[in-house]
């Protein structure tokens, strides 16, 4: 149960998580215009990975995409790889976690592969997760460098005479929901990680023990398996389904209403 | 067919108060952000204030500003200035203007005249 | 508040001869954004409300002849007209749309000569 829920709740943890960073990605608002300390302007700036668009006062937004590869910093390079790998990996891991759900019945598969599935999701979050906090990072890391610079230079001009206001930008809306989605989708790869342990089959070795009941005897073999007749004590708060004595988080029938999170 | 009608101006006392009123038709009044810009008999054109489209940003004239409130009801497709102790300085004719690309004025009202005299 | 200077402050034109006005602004009102100057050009006839000729200091509004064009960069602004036209008679006034108040020029008589 107790598996279910934390493999269940890492999985719609890592879903928001994901939906977050794709978001983030395509948001326009990754700097926006500094407006403290500055001349209130009738023009408002904000800058994506993808464009650059200028709001007016008059209500009017113009986007331009950067239709330039070479162009661009190398940073920004960098912060568009990392998002797009994480959203990649965050994909193919939700993908894999769909199959790994141990809500979810697929024909005859083994609880060993359920396990290696979740672990599998549950690292590709965590990288996926790591990816956008270190691209949101850079980013951030990037605004905080050309903002101070600019601040130095603020004001340049020709003779004194002319002033030119230089346009300083900071940490836009897009930044924090990265922050946030990419904390989310590691946290979710944690939690499928952690449901992953739950999920795989003990190999305790336990003796074979024979039980002797008036000519009737019931042979419980090391792994958990009933092997012949339809009773026998039900030891270390086991449930009987389908002919199959094991624990319950490793019962894989059909679930009941418990078995949701 | 875009129209801006302006109306309430009149002669008013010093220290005294005045609602201009601009009604809008022929586009999409609630898009837009909106002005009120005044002329002083014999001078040149000066900005009073501006409203945005979503009602969230007001700007005004230094000369203005705490004297004059602008406003809109999108309902009524109307632009308001409430003018309070107005003075002598106030006399002018006032334009409402609607914004367009480049926050230009890119259509004007026909204008009402504001007397401010004892 | 940004400053907007024009000059000439009257013009005598006569008719089918080119004008040119000039304005310039305190500050610089290139938008480093979209590379756009947010300088308006309005002329105001006698007896009339102004009217928009050219936003982004040089985009001419629709329904303007194209004997009227701006150009100018950051501060320095100017209006041509190439051949002045009976109509082009007024009062034209340059405006400051970047920074907050949106200040007007002192305004250019364009007169018949």
């Known amino acids: 149960m107790a598996v279910t829920a934390c493999q269940g709740l890492g999985f719609v943890v890592s879903l928001i998580g994901i939906a977050g960073i794709i978001a983030a990605t395509c948001m326009d608002q990754w700097s926006t215009q500094d407006l403290y300390n500055n001349p209130v302007t009738a023009v408002f700036n904000y800058q994506g990975l993808w464009r650059s668009c200028v709001r007016e006062s008059s209500g009017f937004t113009e986007c331009r995409g950067y239709f330039t590869l070479l162009g661009l910093p190398a940073m920004l390079q960098a912060v568009r790889a990392l998002m797009i790998v994480g959203i990649v990996l965050g994909a193919i891991g939700l993908l894999v976690s769909i199959f790994a759900l141990k809500c979810i019945r697929i024909g005859s598969m083994e609880d060993s592969a359920k396990a290696n599935m979740t672990l599998t999701s549950g690292i590709m979050f965590i990288v996926s997760g790591l990816c956008a906090i270190a691209g949101v990072s850079v980013f951030a890391n990037m605004l905080v460098t050309n903002f101070w610079m600019s601040t130095a230079n603020m004001y340049t001009g020709m003779g004194g005479m002319v002033q030119t206001v230089q346009t300083r930008y900071t940490f836009g809306a897009a930044l924090f929901v990265g922050w946030v989605a990419g904390g989310l989708t590691l946290i979710g790869g944690v939690m499928m990680c952690i449901a992953c342990r739950g999920l795989a089959p003990e190999e305790t070795n336990y003796k074979a023990v024979s039980y002797h009941a008036s000519g009737h005897s019931v042979a419980y073999k090391p792994g958990g398996f009933k092997a012949s007749t339809g009773f026998g004590s039900n030891t270390k708060n086991k449930k009987i389904y389908d002919g199959g004595a094991r624990t319950e988080d490793e019962v894989q029938s059909y679930p009941s209403k418990h078995d949701y999170v | 067919e875009v129209q801006l009608v302006e109306s309430g101006g009149g002669l008013v006392k010093p220290g005294g108060s005045l609602r201009l009123s601009c009604a809008a038709s022929?586009?999409?009044?609630?898009?837009?952000?909106m002005s009120w810009v005044r002329q002083a008999p014999g001078k040149g054109l000066e900005w009073v204030s501006t409203?945005?489209?979503?009602?969230?940003?007001?700007y005004y004239a230094d000369s203005v500003k705490g004297r004059f409130t602008i406003s809109r009801d999108n309902a009524k497709n109307s632009l308001y200035l409430q003018m309070n102790s107005l003075r002598a300085e106030d006399t002018a004719v006032y334009y409402c203007?609607?914004?367009?690309?480049?926050?230009?004025?890119?259509?004007w009202g026909q204008g009402t005249l504001v007397t401010v005299s004892s | 508040d940004i400053v907007m200077t024009q000059t000439p402050l009257s013009l005598p034109v006569t008719p089918g001869e080119p004008a040119s006005i000039s304005c310039k602004s305190s500050?610089?009102?290139?938008?480093?954004?979209?590379?756009?100057?947010?300088l308006t050009w309005y002329l105001q006839k006698p007896g009339q409300s102004p009217q928009l000729l050219i936003y982004?200091?040089?985009t001419r509004e629709s329904g303007v002849p194209d004997r009227f064009s701006g150009s100018g960069s950051g501060t320095d602004f100017t209006l041509k007209i190439s051949r002045v036209e009976a109509e082009d008679f007024g009062v034209y006034y340059c405006?400051?749309?970047?920074?907050?108040?949106?200040?007007f020029g002192g305004g250019t008589k364009v007169e018949i000569k």
């Open positions: 203007a609607r914004q367009g690309y480049g926050n230009a004025l890119d259509y």
């Open positions: 022929g586009f999409s009044f609630s898009n837009s952000a």
């Open positions: 409203i945005s489209s979503g009602d969230s940003y007001t």
């Open positions: 500050q610089s009102l290139l938008n480093s954004g979209n590379q756009k100057n947010y």
């Open positions: 982004w200091s040089s």
């Open positions: 405006q400051n749309d970047y920074y907050y108040p949106l200040t």
